[in-house]
């Protein structure tokens, strides 16, 4: 008995598609070995038609593919544009065609139901529009035109030129009679339903001279597109429903076990709470197409999704839809990173953002998810160094630690900073991730003064107190600019055993600016890190004023006022396109700040770790 399993018999009609799923035991070897679909010949040999290694036979070119779903232990063979010649005996299998694990499949492609001679076949997806063409002779031009539906042996009138409309087609059908000289009338049916499926008869005139034309209408449910994404990653559903519904409310819903469809998000402002913070519906293009992005994928997000259009913002029969079957791969390439990061008011957070390590040169971004209406995610910072104005001095995006992870640091936290943030790049969109920042009770671990005013030409010392738990961490001061935070050169940090023992008097790292220049004005951060992994930071704003009093200026670390009002900087306004999903800026038009200029000069700034006694007792 072969462990490979699939459908023993598959039957379809000419012109249609089939999607054949074969199951195999998902052992490590099986998951990664070659998968194939072959046709058994008279000689008993099985000729490969399509394989997981990219081979497609000439007979299948452009109409077939094979997709492996290793985690599920399945692979799917899709074959389109079936013809009677495709009928035959096949095998789906693993390894080598002649010896390996396989399963026999019989495919039968029939002509479809016997139709009257001259029948025109119309194949249309549910919810779409069909135009049935009905020719007639000149003598029937002035006579009644009608469309009937054949049900069994009877014909039921659907519409006629005397303004009759069958109630089943009310508000979605019209009969058009062209001007003189054109010997054809048309019947347009909108918002097709599955129940509209069947054989129709056009008629012009009556009696033995009447004109008749048969039309076979096949209304199909859209074939779901199989989508296979990684756990913790992101998926994008592109939905193009046509111009007819460009101005109608749009939605994405998920099919439940009762075969109804629960709204995930719609353009009327509804959103499923399970997707809070990790979903966006981008603005529509002129043609009515739109996209929905879901990040932070979970196993429970798997299922069948439909997008559609209806004034109620939810699924209704007879309106156009598109379908996807989402599978979430638990063997994810996307590394685990915290989905919730906690910080205290006045403190900071350091968020690790994964990106595709093959795309180290890609631009990195961080945006704030806003749930209003369809959701938007205005960019706050990007690796090119542009930072939104209100985040000046407290937000930085660092390329470290690199190799598939970048870091975003946000300090001077307030309760307003609580919310969902997205990490993204201008590369692989599947690596978008979501992190929630929560503001909890507590005190910041690093203590720096609030307002600092330095005097031109003099020496400035700024202390930063840290608790014992950071004694083994690397301490640093850096000068913030909108392109990052430039680490300032560090002076001797004192005897290392002082930190090991965590002497009460050694929990201080000081920044010295000597002499102070105009260029020193700006934001400075005190921070701790371990290797390339950043911990807490604290920010202090240094204002520079003209000399009034001689002598060095010492600042008390105990006086931690709020930071001064941020400087108003010239703001360039950047237009963000709504090419939503390709455009990483994610549906926002944002202000950005120009670069704030020079960094502090190297030799004039120094970082000193010393005891608080050396601060002249200013902390007492």
């Amino acid at each position: 008995k072969s462990p490979v399993f699939g459908p023993q018999e598959v039957s379809s009609v000419e012109g249609n598609s089939v999607s054949i799923k074969c199951y195999y035991p998902p052992t490590s070897v099986n998951r990664h070995t070659r998968k194939y679909w072959c046709r058994k010949g008279a000689s008993g040999r099985c000729i490969t038609l399509v394989s997981s290694e990219g081979y497609v036979s000439s007979n299948y070119a452009g109409r077939a593919n094979l997709t492996n779903f290793p985690e599920n232990g399945t692979f799917v063979v899709n074959i389109a544009q079936l013809s009677r010649d495709d009928s035959g005996h096949y095998k789906c299998g693993l390894g080598i065609n002649s010896r390996g694990l396989s399963f026999d499949v019989s495919l039968e492609v029939s002509q479809g139901p016997e139709l009257p001679n001259g029948t025109e076949v119309y194949t249309v997806d549910v919810g779409r529009t069909v135009t049935i063409k009905c020719p007639f002779k000149t003598e029937n031009a002035p006579k009644t035109k009608a469309l009937y539906k054949k049900i069994g042996q009877t014909s039921v009138l659907v519409i006629d030129s005397r303004n009759y409309v069958n109630p089943n087609y009310k508000d979605r059908i019209r009969l058009r009679i062209p001007g003189t000289g054109q010997l054809i009338f048309t019947v347009v049916i909108d918002r097709l339903r599955l129940s509209d499926h069947g054989l129709y008869l056009c008629q012009a005139g009556d009696g033995s001279n009447r004109d008749e034309k048969n039309a076979d209408l096949q209304v199909l449910e859209p074939e779901p597109e199989l989508v296979y994404e990684d756990l913790r990653g992101s998926v994008t559903f592109h939905c193009a429903l046509g111009l007819e519904v460009a101005n109608v409310a749009k939605f994405l819903c998920r099919v439940n076990s009762r075969e109804t469809c629960d709204v995930v998000i719609n353009t009327l402002g509804k959103r499923d709470s399970a997707f809070e913070g990790r979903i966006l519906l981008n603005p529509q293009d002129k043609d009515g197409s739109f996209s929905v992005v879901i990040t932070g994928l979970r196993k429970e997000d798997e299922g069948r999704y439909l997008c559609g259009a209806h004034s109620d913002g939810q699924l209704q029969e007879g309106w156009p839809i598109q379908a996807w079957q989402l599978f979430v791969n638990e063997e994810s390439t996307i590394p685990r990173s915290p989905t919730v990061v906690k910080g205290v008011a006045g403190g900071s957070v350091a968020v690790l953002c994964p990106y595709n390590p093959k795309e180290s040169q890609s631009l990195k971004y961080w945006c704030l998810w806003e749930g209003a209406q369809n959701g938007r995610c205005p960019l706050l910072v990007e690796s090119q160094g542009l930072v939104q104005e209100q985040y000046e001095g407290r937000l930085s995006l660092l390329q470290e630690p690199g190799n598939g992870t970048f870091t975003v640091i946000l300090n001077q936290l307030t309760t307003q900073d609580a919310g969902f943030y997205w990490c993204l790049t201008n590369g692989d969109t599947r690596w978008r991730t979501t992190v929630e920042i929560k503001i909890i009770e507590g005190e910041p671990n690093l203590k720096v003064p609030g307002n600092v005013t330095a005097v031109l030409g003099e020496t400035l010392n700024i202390p930063c107190h840290f608790p014992c738990k950071f004694s083994s961490y690397e301490k640093y001061w850096c000068k913030w600019s909108n392109t990052g935070c430039q680490t300032l050169p560090s002076q001797d940090e004192g005897p290392s055993e002082a930190f090991v023992n965590c002497d009460e008097n050694s929990r201080l790292v000081s920044l010295t600016l000597n002499p102070v220049t105009r260029a020193d004005e700006g934001w400075y951060w005190c921070g701790v890190k371990q290797g390339h992994f950043y911990g807490e930071t604290a920010a202090v704003y240094v204002a520079v004023e003209e000399k009034k009093v001689a002598g060095s200026r010492y600042v008390s670390p105990a006086k931690a006022d709020a930071a001064p009002d941020e400087k108003v900087l010239d703001s360039g306004v950047r237009e963000i396109e709504n090419k939503a999903i390709q455009d990483p800026r994610l549906f926002a038009e944002e202000k950005v700040v120009a670069d704030t200029g020079d960094q502090a000069g190297g030799s004039r700034a120094s970082v000193d770790s010393s005891s608080s006694e050396e601060q002249g007792g200013s902390s007492k």
């Epitope: 459908p7 379809s12 449910e221 079957q325």
Partner: nanobody, 127 residues
Framework: EVQLVESGGGLVQAGDSLRLSCAAS????????MGWFRQGPGKEREFVAA??????????YYEDSVKGRFTISRDNAKNTAYLQMNSLKPEDTAVYYC??????????????????WGQGTLVTVSS
């Protein structure tokens, strides 16, 4: 909601034939799945056959031991699935259950893939 009612079970001799029916009421769309499972005395419930359809495509699945003897089919208009059982053997004795699901993506052999179940019909094959 979909309700399923099985019929056609009974007592037959080995080698005889029997046809089981499963009538579905309620909404069934242009896609879905119907399966037959059985539970013999003192045994686990096991897969027998399944039929999946999507638009005009039909997929039929069989358990190895019934291949060539059992045939699954469906009458669209009557919303009914059938299991034609030929060359019956004593080991086919079991309660046969019909199952249905609006989705066509689960493994048809997995009973957990089906949302709706009938109450079962007993088939006894004497030697």
């Amino acid at each position: 909601e979909v309700q399923l009612v099985e019929s056609g079970g009974g007592l037959v001799q080995a080698g005889d034939s029997l046809r089981l029916s499963c009538a579905a009421s309620g909404r069934t769309g242009s896609s879905g799945a119907m399966g037959w499972f059985r539970q013999g005395p003192g045994k686990e419930r096991e897969f027998v056959a399944a039929l999946m359809w999507r638009n005009t495509v039909t997929y039929k699945y069989y358990e190895d031991s019934v291949k060539g003897r059992f045939t699954i089919s469906r009458d669209n208009a009557k919303n009914t699935a059938y299991l034609q059982m030929n060359s019956l053997k004593p080991e086919d004795t079991a309660v046969y259950y019909c199952a249905a699901d609006p989705d066509t993506y689960g493994d048809p052999r997995n009973s957990g893939a089906y949302d709706y179940w009938g109450q079962g019909t007993l088939v006894t094959v004497s030697s």
